[in-house]
């Protein structure tokens, strides 16, 4: 199997396997594996609520708790991305684990992830046309963090 | 230029450009770009200390502040990875931004990142031998999070 560097894509170079010779599934799986949620769900998956648990995975014990949302696109590599969604606008009190503390904001930590989209290659027609992997930056939220509100100068 | 799927590597499949025809620089740069640090700096990068700032980037405003340490390996794709290093064992008080609160732990959020290492392909000899990109999972810390300590049953 050859992944050809295609000079026709708008973002060069790009790997262009032909349509009838799809990219190996395993190769795509690797890319997918790199963006599984950082924190595996252990034990019970706690109901998505604005509270900091005393057990379970890190994202539910955090005082800026979050859940993971799956973002799947079969024409993208990786196909599966996970976005952290903050469950509270403010941080949860360390004392109670439930009441919010207005002194702290629960905010997402963003990251521009490089992804590739499968596109028809320029100038390729017919049934055996090649496909390009076109590079894009894609914004994902990795986690939620408890921060002190910004003080404007 | 062809990136051949090599059946000889212990971790299959792998792209194997020959040594004299290096992998396209741009393609590898893309991979590198995907793991630039999540949070861009705004204004001053504060000296590494256990305090939560009221301005600056998210990692210095967090009550579980962290710094980023560069991990570079020229035989890895991506070459540059960043590890979050927690600056405090406990969370910083939201009130003062400096005193630690023993009710909360500042802990790293770990993620098994997929990386590729360049290795000589099995059975390839001589000056024009091919190189494999061998898949590995590599543990990185993305950020530090303030959590309630785990209560053991």
């Amino acid at each position: 199997v050859s992944l050809r560097i295609q000079e026709g894509c708008s973002h060069l170079p790009s790997c262009c396997p032909s349509k009838e010779q799809e990219p190996p599934e395993e190769w795509l799986k690797w890319s997918s594996a790199s963006v599984s949620p950082p924190e595996p769900l252990s034990h019970t998956h706690h109901a998505e609520s604005c509270r900091a648990s005393k057990d379970g995975p890190l994202n539910s014990r955090a005082i800026s708790p979050w859940s993971y949302e799956l973002d799947r696109d079969l024409n993208r590599v990786p196909q599966d991305l996970y976005h952290a969604r903050c469950l509270c606008p403010h941080c949860v009190s360390l004392q109670t684990g439930s009441h919010m503390d207005p002194l702290g904001n629960s905010v997402p930590l963003y990251h521009n992830q490089t992804v590739f989209y499968r596109r028809p290659c320029h100038g390729e027609e017919g049934t055996h046309r090649r496909y390009c992997l076109e590079r894009r930056l894609y914004r994902v939220s990795l986690a939620c963090v408890c921060v002190r509100p910004r003080v404007m100068a | 230029v062809s990136l051949r799927i090599q059946e000889g590597c212990s971790h299959l499949p792998s792209c194997c450009p020959s040594k004299e025809q290096e992998p396209p620089e741009e393609w590898l740069k893309w991979s590198s770009a995907s793991v630039s640090p999540p949070e861009p700096l705004s204004h001053t990068h504060h000296a590494e200390s256990c305090r939560a700032s009221k301005d600056g980037p998210l990692n210095s405003r967090a009550i579980s502040p962290w710094s980023y340490e560069l991990d570079r390996d020229l035989n890895r794709v991506p070459q540059d990875l960043y590890h979050a290093r927690c600056l405090c064992p406990h969370c910083v008080s939201l009130q003062t931004g400096s005193h630690m609160d023993p009710l909360g732990n500042s802990v790293p959020l770990y993620h098994n990142q997929t990386v590729f290492y360049r290795r000589p392909c099995h059975g390839e000899e001589g000056t024009h031998r091919r190189y494999c990109l061998e898949r590995r999972l590599y543990r990185v810390s993305l950020a530090c999070v303030c959590v309630r300590p785990r209560v053991m049953a």
């Epitope: - | 590898l28 893309w30 630039s36 640090p37 980037p57 710094s67 980023y68 020229l74 960043y82």
Partner: antibody, heavy 122, light 107 residues
Framework: EVQLVESGAEVKKPGASVKVSCKAS????????MNWVRQAPGQRLEWMGL????????SYNQNFKGRVTLTVDTSASTAYLELNSLRSEDTGVYYC???????????????WGQGTLVTVSS | DIQMTQSPSSLSASVGDRVTITCSAS??????LNWYQQKPGKVPKLLIY???SLHSGVPSRFSGSGSGTDFTLTISSLQPEDVATYYC?????????FGQGTKLEIK
């Protein structure tokens, strides 16, 4: 035109600290790592560490045993080197140097500041 | 740390001579080697990166070669403006390390 302009010469006593600045212009400051290199009189160049202005990611030469702190102010396109617990052997010229890279084959210091002479003497 | 050793430490040659400076690494560094030129009283300048690639604006009389542990910087025809100290630098691993320098003079 890429330029790195460093702060002026300093004279310090042993045990004191020094902070050297390096103002960058002519390129995207956050897009390139900044290295710091020192040259003691008659000695080889010695790499002290680097910082990525994008988020303050650092790598330090452990031979300096935690005495070095690198920071940046992206709003001013300025990098800073702070060296603590100064001793006489820290006397030398301190350079900031931008690191160019292609993401795969090379990392090279393609532009250098004019250097800051730091003299440590009692 | 990876140790870099240059030889000779100093040399004197005539204008038009072919000059060779060698650099040896304490362990294999593939081709991850740069050369810098520092003229007297001046700032170091990048000359060659990745063993053999000429930095922009560098005259073609300069060339580099080698791989693994042994590297060479060659000036095919020495010019008066080439008087300087030349340093090799490895970037395979942190900390980056430099050779002790080779001081080149004109006879």
């Amino acid at each position: 035109e890429v330029q790195l302009v460093e702060s002026g010469a300093e004279v310090k006593k042993p045990g004191a600290s020094v902070k050297v600045s390096c103002k960058a212009s002519g390129y995207s400051f956050s897009g390139y790592t900044m290295n710091w290199v020192r040259q003691a009189p008659g000695q080889r160049l010695e790499w002290m560490g680097l910082i990525n202005p994008y988020n303050g990611g650092t790598s330090y030469n452990q031979n300096f045993k935690g005495r070095v702190t690198l920071t940046v102010d992206t709003s001013a396109s300025t990098a800073y080197l702070e060296l603590n617990s100064l001793r006489s052997e820290d006397t030398g010229v301190y350079y900031c140097a931008r690191e160019d890279y292609d993401g795969y084959l090379y990392f090279a210091m393609d532009y250098w500041g004019q250097g800051t002479l730091v003299t440590v003497s009692s | 740390d990876i140790q870099m050793t240059q030889s000779p430490s100093s040399l004197s040659a005539s204008v038009g001579d072919r000059v060779t400076i060698t650099c040896s690494a304490s362990q294999g560094i593939s081709n991850y080697l740069n050369w810098y030129q520092q003229k007297p009283g001046k700032v170091p300048k990048l000359l060659i990166y990745y063993t053999s690639s000429l930095h922009s604006g560098v005259p073609s009389r300069f060339s580099g070669s080698g791989s693994g542990t042994d590297f060479t910087l060659t000036i095919s025809s020495l010019q008066p403006e080439d008087v300087a100290t030349y340093y090799c630098q490895q970037y395979l691993a942190f900390p980056y390390t430099f050779g002790q320098g080779t001081k080149l003079e004109i006879k």
